[in-house]
Interface confidence: low
């Protein structure tokens, strides 16, 4: 009896797992085995597909085959008993295009009021997503085990800290991976649950802020108790986006090791241009707090947010204010690549009534002034970036007298 070739072959690819499924054509024939060949683009010859030879079931795994995932391949299958069926050819496909993203692996660490999530990207050590790992983002769903109220958090980092949780409370979470440009996403990972620890005697430092003074960065934070020592660590922000870098190291800022105040000062040249993460930890000699929430610190924005420098041209009924780049020491202007908004406050010298102008331009007219009157002006800069919402301190006030009448031309 002639064997019929199998039909309806399906190729399932999840990360680097390649699975083939098919239907038997002739259920009545026992002891039938199935074998696959494959063919790469531009090749005439067919090659036996290892892992899929003489298979008795209707499923096989060819993950061990080291394929170029960007290269189109073709498969064919036949049934074998004493004789063989004709080959059935499967539509050619490109593994990378066909592949689905598998759920990420998740490892949890508990703090008293936070959970640290370590995410291993899909296809951890495989070829399929080897070049795509920096492009993944993650959706984290978290809920108290005793409640069904789920909170969703989006992250581009491989290590994410979820703060503002309750001590000694069990939280559950699941994570899915998303690749926006490929328009693919995984299913959610299995649910992981963890109980936060008993409340630490020492809370973490809060409200960390960085400012610039002269050639130094000044890092300040708030803390509940006195007589503490603090340490500050930094990390390149991009290292937390780099999945190959689970072993990234937070580094100490030497000038901020074991400081006894709630601030530390370190030279601006400690950091090259770039975006960094900073965190602070408190200790009383016996106990140590958990690390504070990490703050994002952009050296460029930080440098730009020195207060603006401005000149005033006085007319009888208005001031023309020309805003320039702030000066560093050595009188060199700071180059500004970021769009800024300027807030200008002015008032009559003899009055406390302040008026405000918000302006994107660097030349600003302050209208409706009285002639021969002394007005004072101060200004500050704000970034227009919502994610890095920063403001400079106000400049020193500059006071000028308006001209006599009829000099507005």
């Amino acid at each position: 009896k002639n064997l019929k070739s199998p039909q309806k072959v399906e190729v399932d690819i999840i990360d680097d797992n390649f699975i083939l499924r098919w239907n038997r054509s002739d259920e009545s024939v026992g002891n039938v085995t199935f074998s696959f060949d494959y063919q790469k683009t531009g090749m005439d010859n067919w090659i036996k597909l290892s892992g899929c030879q003489n298979i008795t079931s209707t499923k096989c795994n060819f993950s061990s085959l080291k394929l170029n995932v960007y290269e189109e391949i073709k498969l064919r299958i036949r049934a074998e008993k004493e004789n063989t069926s004709s080959w059935y050819e499967v539509d050619s496909f490109t593994p990378f295009r066909k592949a689905q993203i598998g759920p990420p692996e998740v490892h949890l660490e508990a703090e008293d009021k936070a959970i640290v999530i370590h995410i291993s990207p899909p296809g951890q050590d495989g070829n399929m997503w080897a070049l795509e790992k920096p492009s993944f983002s993650y959706t984290i769903r978290i809920w108290q085990k005793s409640s069904s109220d789920k909170k969703t958090i989006n992250s581009t980092y491989y290590v994410e800290k979820i703060p503002e949780l309750l001590p000694e409370t069990t939280y559950c979470l699941e994570v899915k991976a998303i690749h926006p440009s490929l328009k693919k996403h995984s299913n959610y990972s299995p649910v992981h649950c963890i109980k936060t620890t008993v409340e630490n005697e020492l809370p973490p430092p809060e409200n960390i802020e960085v400012s610039v003074q002269n050639q130094n960065y000044v890092l300040k934070w708030d803390y509940t108790y006195a007589n503490m020592t603090f340490q500050v660590q930094w990390l390149h922000a991009f290292l937390k986006r780099n999945p190959g870098n689970h072993l990234y190291k937070w580094k100490q800022i030497p000038d901020c090791e074991n400081v006894k105040t709630t601030q530390c000062v370190f030279p601006q040249n400690v950091f090259q241009k770039g975006i960094y993460l900073l965190r602070v930890q408190a200790s009383d000699g016996n106990n140590t707090s958990f690390w504070s929430e990490e703050i994002k610190f952009d050296t460029e924005i930080q440098a730009f947010l020195l207060p603006p420098v401005f000149n005033i041209r006085s007319l009888s009924d208005s001031f023309h204010i020309y805003i320039g780049a702030p000066k560093q020491s050595g009188n060199t202007p700071v180059i500004q690549d970021y769009p800024l908004i300027y807030e200008i406050i002015f008032w009559e010298n003899t009055s406390n009534a302040e008026r405000k102008i918000i302006e994107k331009k660097t030349d600003v007219t302050v209208p409706n002034l009285k002639p021969l009157t002394v007005y004072c002006v101060k200004a500050r800069a704000h970034t227009m970036d919502e994610k890095l919402n920063k403001s400079s301190v106000f400049s020193d006030a500059v006071c000028e007298k308006t001209k006599p009448g009829n000099t507005s031309k």
Epitope: H236, G244, K249, K251, I253, V270, Q272, K273
Partner: antibody, heavy 123, light 107 residues
């Protein structure tokens, strides 16, 4: 002044390993990454990897992961590279070079180089 | 890995010439680019880091420029001692990678 001292030459038999040294002076050894770079005869430069002498954290070029092992001895300010199972393909000059600072210049350039050790693999 | 492509493998030049060597990265490297000079039998010497910063002791006739993926090393007036091979290298992303080198020869 900053110096990285390397022995001039090593003659090795095929299949044998070799351990090359790089002695640092003139700076705080544990404050800068230490890189290793290969240059085969008449060819360009290839980065092998780097080690943080303060805690022996290593970043390898995957191409050399099975070939090279980086270590340091902090007490003598010396970095080492061990090359295993040598073949003629491993005949090259191996340079050590100081990299960016561990704290201040994390991804800095390789500013000081040793003179290189010429490894010849021959029976 | 990030590929670094140097435009020419060799240049035949005259003393006093102005010379430009270009280097293109396969992805953005945020100015983490170094230029090295290597003479036969010697170790590479760092000329420029951060794409534009001239190292101490390097003559001012050397300069670096560029951003994102495209970078340039310029020598304003070529001297005899500048005859060497020049390499660019990115140190933005591990593994650090070098260009294939540009060799200068005197006409």
């Amino acid at each position: 002044q900053v110096q990285l001292q390397q022995p001039g030459t090593e003659l090795v038999k095929p299949g044998s390993p070799v351990k090359l040294s790089c002695k640092a002076s003139g700076y705080t050894f544990t404050s800068f990454w230490l890189n290793w770079v290969q240059q085969r005869p008449g060819r360009g430069l290839e980065w092998i990897g780097k080690i943080d002498p303060s805690d022996s954290e290593i970043r390898y070029n995957q191409k050399f992961k099975d070939k090279a092992t980086l270590t340091v001895d902090k007490s003598s300010n010396t970095a080492y590279i061990q090359l295993s199972s040598l073949t003629s393909e491993d005949s090259a000059v191996y340079y050590c070079a100081r990299g960016g600072g561990i704290y201040y210049d994390y991804d800095g350039a390789m500013d000081y180089w040793g003179q290189g050790t010429s490894v010849t693999v021959s029976s | 890995d990030i590929q670094m492509t140097q435009s020419s493998s060799s240049f035949s030049v005259s003393l006093g010439d102005r010379l430009t060597i270009t280097c293109k990265a396969s992805e953005v490297i945020y100015n983490r680019l170094a230029w090295f000079q290597q003479k036969p039998g010697n170790a590479p010497r760092l000329l420029i880091s951060g794409a534009t910063s001239l190292e101490t002791g390097v003559p001012s006739r050397f300069s670096g420029s560029g951003s994102r993926k495209d970078y340039t090393l310029s020598i304003s007036s070529l001297q005899t001692e500048d005859v060497a091979t020049y390499y660019c290298q990115q140190y933005w992303s591990s593994p650090f990678t070098f260009g294939s080198g540009t060799k200068l020869e005197i006409k």
